[in-house]
């Protein structure tokens, strides 16, 4: 039975040209995290493998940086970066936990971080 929950940075906003940290945290489970994938729609941004480290997809290498921790830093933001981002935790033996972050990239300097909130797991694959 999957008992874990993923806490994310939730709904966040940032300024065009700036950078933002996407962060997720898996708790309430003793499952071993084997890999974390960061995704946007059907695009794979990055993989953090527990043994092998980070792989940033070549499409994003210029403006995505690994970390901090299992998080991901997006740089040189554009308005086109607005949208949903997902952290996919591959774990053993639980399966897959998914967290969602919505990023809004703003033209002006009114960007501010949304509150953190918890998302219970809602995807499960073996």
């Amino acid at each position: 039975m999957m008992t874990g929950t993923i806490e994310t940075t939730g709904n966040i906003s940032a300024e065009k040209g700036g950078s933002i940290i996407l962060q997720c945290h898996l708790s309430s489970t003793t499952a071993q995290v084997t890999q974390v994938n960061w995704e946007q729609q059907d695009q794979l941004l990055a993989i953090c493998n527990a043994d092998l480290g980070w792989h940033i997809s070549p499409s994003f290498k210029d403006r995505v940086a690994p970390g901090p921790g299992l998080g991901l830093t997006l740089q040189s933001l554009t308005v086109n970066d607005t949208g949903e981002y997902f952290c996919i935790y591959h774990t053993y033996p639980d399966g897959t936990y998914t967290g969602r972050i919505f990023l809004e990239v703003l033209e002006s300097s009114v960007a501010e971080h949304g509150a953190r909130f918890q998302i219970p797991h809602h995807h499960h694959h073996h």
């Epitope: 084997t34 890999q35 994938n37 995704e39 059907d42 695009q43 794979l44 993989i47 493998n49 527990a50 043994d51 092998l52 480290g53 980070w54 792989h55 997809s57 070549p58 499409s59 591959h90 694959h125």
Partner: antibody, heavy 120, light 107 residues
Amino acid sequence: EVQLQESGPGLVKPSETLSLTCAVSGYSITSDSWNWIRQPPGKKLEWMGYISYSGNTYYNPSLKSRITISRDTSKNQFSLKLSSVTAADTAVYYCARLDFSNYGGAVDYWGQGTTVTVSS
Amino acid sequence: DIVMTQSPDSLAVSLGERATINCKASQNVRTAVAWYQQKPGQSPKLMIYSASYRYTGVPDRFSGSGSGTDFTLTISSLQAEDVAVYYCQQYYTTPWTFGGGTKVEIK
């Protein structure tokens, strides 16, 4: 240039342990990921597992109870042991390097492969 | 495990013509797909990674496309040296898995 060379017996009896070694030249096995991949006759390539730059291992769950991958950094080589073999383990066995940082799980260097037959 | 299914099993194409190989994943693997070429008696060679990026030294007549579950390897103008078996592989999650291969021959 990275070169990998498999060695080991070409014939193994059923229920015994298959042992292969991969000698690596032109690159240190304390970097990147070092893999074993096999191809049974007329079947798909099957990724068996890896040993990482730090010595951590990951095994395909289908083989987990039978497989061991180890390394000897002083000789710059890594090894495969597969226990309790059956005819289904007859295959060409490849050792391979994977540069995860640049190519993810895509394998960029392969050995030439060695054929292992399981038969009494 | 994620199953990678290739089609067709074999393909005969005239020299200079286009060859198209398909690969379907049993679940969404985003762009975590590689393609390999294996000539008779040789080990596989990496051709494409991250679905569409050519590996070092791969001729530009080879291209990869797709995301999600459907992927394609295209040889825009088949050359005699392209006769081989081509395999797709997913590395979205372990265990990394391969397709069954597509044999490309000269018509």
